[in-house]
Interface confidence: low
Amino acid sequence: GITIPRNPGCPNSEDKNFPRTVMVNLNIHNRNTNTNPKRSSDYYNRSTSPWNLHRNEDPERYPSVIWEAKCRHLGCINADGNVDYHMNSVPIQQEILVLRREPPHCPNSFRLEKILVSVGCTCVTPIVHHVA
Amino acid sequence: GITIPRNPGCPNSEDKNFPRTVMVNLNIHNRNTNTNPKRSSDYYNRSTSPWNLHRNEDPERYPSVIWEAKCRHLGCINADGNVDYHMNSVPIQQEILVLRREPPHCPNSFRLEKILVSVGCTCVTPIVHHVA
C-alpha cells in the first residue's frame, strides 16, 4: 500500500486496551444527498427486472434506515410487457459498512459491521446445465 | 423514533469541543465476506445490461478500495446477442457511508462521508418525450 506520513496534528485517541478504536465525527460530509431511492430515480419501475423497495429500520445501527430491493419476478419483462421465464431477474448486491452500537444502546460507541444489501435488480441469461 | 434507555456501561467518549465524535471499533464484524464483486457473481457479464468493474482506490478513505460499475453499452443486449437501442442500460446507484481521514493522514481520526457509487446496471424502457 501507499505509506503516508502521519500528520503531527492528529488527535491522540489510541487506547491500549482497544487498539483498533478510532474517533469518528458523525457530522456527515455530503449529508444533503437523497436517502430515499424511490425519489432519486424510477428505474425500479421501468426496469425489465423491476423491484420493490423495502424499508429496513434498526435503531441500533447507523444509518438506522436502509432500503432493500426485492425483485418482483423470477423472469424479466419482455417487449410485450409480459414475464419471460427464459431470462431471470436477479438482485445486485453490495457490501456496505454500517456502524453497530456496541455495547448496545450506547450513543457514542460503535463497531464497524459489513452487511450485504440488495440495491436493485438486473436481467440475466440463466445458466443452462446441459445433460450429457 | 424509538427511544432506548442508555446502557450504564457505555464508555464516556463525549468531547465538549466535538460533540458528534464517537468511538468506533474497526475490527469489522462479518469481515470474511467477499469484497471483490467479480468473484461473488458473474451477473456483470450475463446481464442484458452488462457492466465493467473499475477499482477506485483512495488511501485517505476507509474502505480504501471501492468497485465502481460502468455500463458497457447505451442499449441493452437482445435475444440475438445484439445491442438494442430501443432500451437503455443505466447504472443502479447507491449512497454508502465511508470514513474519511480528518485531519488528512491521521490513522485514528475520521469523519463520516456519504458517497454515491454505481453498483451494477439494469435495462430500462426509455422515457419518450412526445413533442406537442
Epitope: 423470477l74 423472469g75 410485450d80 409480459n82 419471460d84 440463466p126 | -
Partner: nanobody, 114 residues
Framework: EVQLVESGGGLVQPGGSLRLSCVAW????????VNWYRQAPGKERELVAG???????DYADSVKGRFTISRDNAKNAVYLRMNMLKPEDTAVYYC????????WGQGTQVAVST
Amino acid sequence: EVQLVESGGGLVQPGGSLRLSCVAWGFSFSIYSVNWYRQAPGKERELVAGITKGGLKDYADSVKGRFTISRDNAKNAVYLRMNMLKPEDTAVYYCNAGRENGYWGQGTQVAVST
C-alpha cells in the same frame, strides 16, 4: 398437431379448491418455461404463476400462498392447484409455453360464486 389443452375448471364456492391441468400434445413440454395466465371479463390478461424448465416457481402477489404450480415432464403436463378461492379469481385460465408468442391453450373457465 401441436397444441396445449387445459382442463379442470368449473364452478366452486368461495374458499373451495380446484386443480387445473395443462397437457402438451405434439411437442416436448420439458424444454419450456410454462405460465398460467387468466383473463376476467373486461380485464387484461394477467400472469398468475410461472414455472421454469428447471422448476423455479413464481406467483402473482394476489395468489401467493393460495396457488401452487407444478410440472410433471414425464406426463408432458403442468398443474395449477388453487386453494382458498375468492370471487375475484373468476376468469378464463390459459396455459402458455415458451415466450408470449409461443404456444397457448384455449383456456378453461373458473367461476367462484356462492
